[in-house]
């Protein structure tokens, strides 16, 4: 929200040098009038009458919806999660038909093994969450199963899953190279073939802060912004204070305009001030300029 | 759910003989796997004897030539013929199943277990 200046007159200076009389300037080329009933409410931007007040669309707020917000909401995912499409040929169960029914007890047995075996196997990677077998067919057990992996939402999230997803890799190869049958007999858990370990497919979430932060700027999308707090983004056009990207307008208040950030100067009644951050100041008696 | 009950177990003398019985009530597991798994004091339970619906057995190097596994899928019962009994042989003696068609002898990977029968050999 804006800081309201304290001023003793209402009339506010462009940093151009014109003289503006209102401190709610339509600095907007599309306009649009709502019209309800007969309630005539001039709804700029999108907006439309509730029948109290305007409702805007985003980025715009105000009596009439005719500024422009100086951060806008967006909302990273909490977590963020990856899919590993892997297929495994387990050799200690041998394959028969009622596998291939997930409601069946055979099904469930070996559904509560495999994940068992395979919390074991990644037990050492904390984004990992567990398995969900998509597939059994024959030959020994052919498992077609989905590794998930989740991690919270920061910056570097896909760096975080790629690493997580090469961890999972060399452990699959790892416990199916070593896990394998002697005589016929599995001492292990589960038993696998080495040669059947693959990797299908890796699916990861695609979340593009700067990209929600455009869309949801429209028009003013190549003025505003994405910086970060905490490891959270904030959409925030030069307007929003306290940002590496703030506009700073001194003796001014800040306005987005469709050319971007724009510094309306402040008239007091001993000063006028102007320059494009609103910087100069001339006293009104001397005319003495100061910087 | 399948409740699986062991019998026959007792105090014997070194070379002599028992026979483990294993009374399954529910699903007869005709289909999958059965085996006899045993745990000695301060030791970690391990496979004494398997078998498995597709014909395939397992007996430990141990009790090879002494132990022998069997079934009666009519009265739903597994067997454990042990001769030539010996001082280690003592321990506690379970009864093991499971619907899967299993090569393991990892008692992990056994689904269904009985209470246990004590068998000691002791002169």
């Known amino acids: 929200p804006l800081a309201t200046i304290p001023v003793s007159t209402t009339s506010l200076t462009s940093s151009e040098g014109s003289t503006i009389s209102t401190p709610s300037v339509d600095i907007s080329t599309p306009v649009t009038t709502s019209i309800v009933g007969d309630q005539c409410s001039r709804c700029k931007n999108g907006g439309f009458w509730d029948g109290l007040k305007c409702q805007c669309l985003t980025p715009y707020y105000g009596e009439s919806c005719e500024e422009v917000v100086n951060s806008i909401d967006i909302a990273p995912p909490e977590t963020v999660s990856a899919q590993m499409e892997l297929t495994v040929t387990v050799t200690s169960v041998k394959f028969t038909d009622e596998l291939k029914n997930h409601s069946s007890q055979e099904f469930r047995e070996f559904n509560k093994t495999f994940t068992e075996q395979m919390n074991i196997v990644y037990s050492g990677i904390p984004e990992y969450v567990g398995v969900n077998i998509t597939n059994l067919r024959l030959g020994s057990v052919v498992v077609e199963h989905d590794v998930l992996l989740r991690t919270k939402y920061t910056p570097e999230y896909k760096t975080a899953l790629d690493n997580a997803t090469e961890v999972v890799k060399q452990k699959i190869t790892k416990v199916t190279t070593e896990q394998i049958m002697t005589n016929d007999n599995c001492s292990a858990l589960m038993c696998f073939n080495t040669t059947g370990t693959q990797v299908q497919n890796i699916t990861v979430t695609q979340y593009d802060p700067v990209e929600e932060c455009r869309q949801k700027a429209e028009e003013y999308e190549d003025y505003f912004l994405v910086e970060y707090r905490d490891q959270k983004p904030y959409c925030i056009s030069p307007c929003e204070s306290g940002f590496n990207a703030s506009k700073n307008c001194n003796h001014g208040k800040c306005q987005m305009s469709q050319n971007g950030a724009r510094c309306l100067c402040v008239t007091t009644e001993t000063h006028w001030y102007s320059g494009e951050d609103c910087n100069q100041g001339t006293q009104k008696s001397h005319h003495h300029h100061h910087h | 759910e399948v409740q699986l009950v062991e019998s026959g177990g007792g105090v014997v003398q070194p070379g002599g003989s028992l026979r483990l019985s294993c009374a399954a009530s529910?699903?007869?597991?005709?289909?999958?796997?059965w085996g006899w798994f045993r745990q000695r004091p301060g030791k970690e339970r391990e496979a004494v004897a398997l078998i498995s619906s597709d014909g395939w057995t397992f007996y430990a190097d141990s009790v090879k030539g002494r132990f022998t596994i069997s079934q009666d899928n009519s009265k739903n019962t597994l067997y454990l013929q042990m001769n030539s009994l010996r001082a280690e042989d003592t321990a506690m003696y379970y009864c093991?199943?499971?619907?899967?068609?299993?090569?393991?002898?990892?008692?992990?990977?056994?689904?269904?277990w009985g209470q246990g029968t004590q068998v000691t050999v002791s002169s």
């Open positions: 093991a199943a499971s619907v899967l068609v299993l090569r393991t002898l990892n008692p992990k990977a056994w689904h269904h």
């Open positions: 529910g699903d007869t597991f005709s289909r999958g796997s």
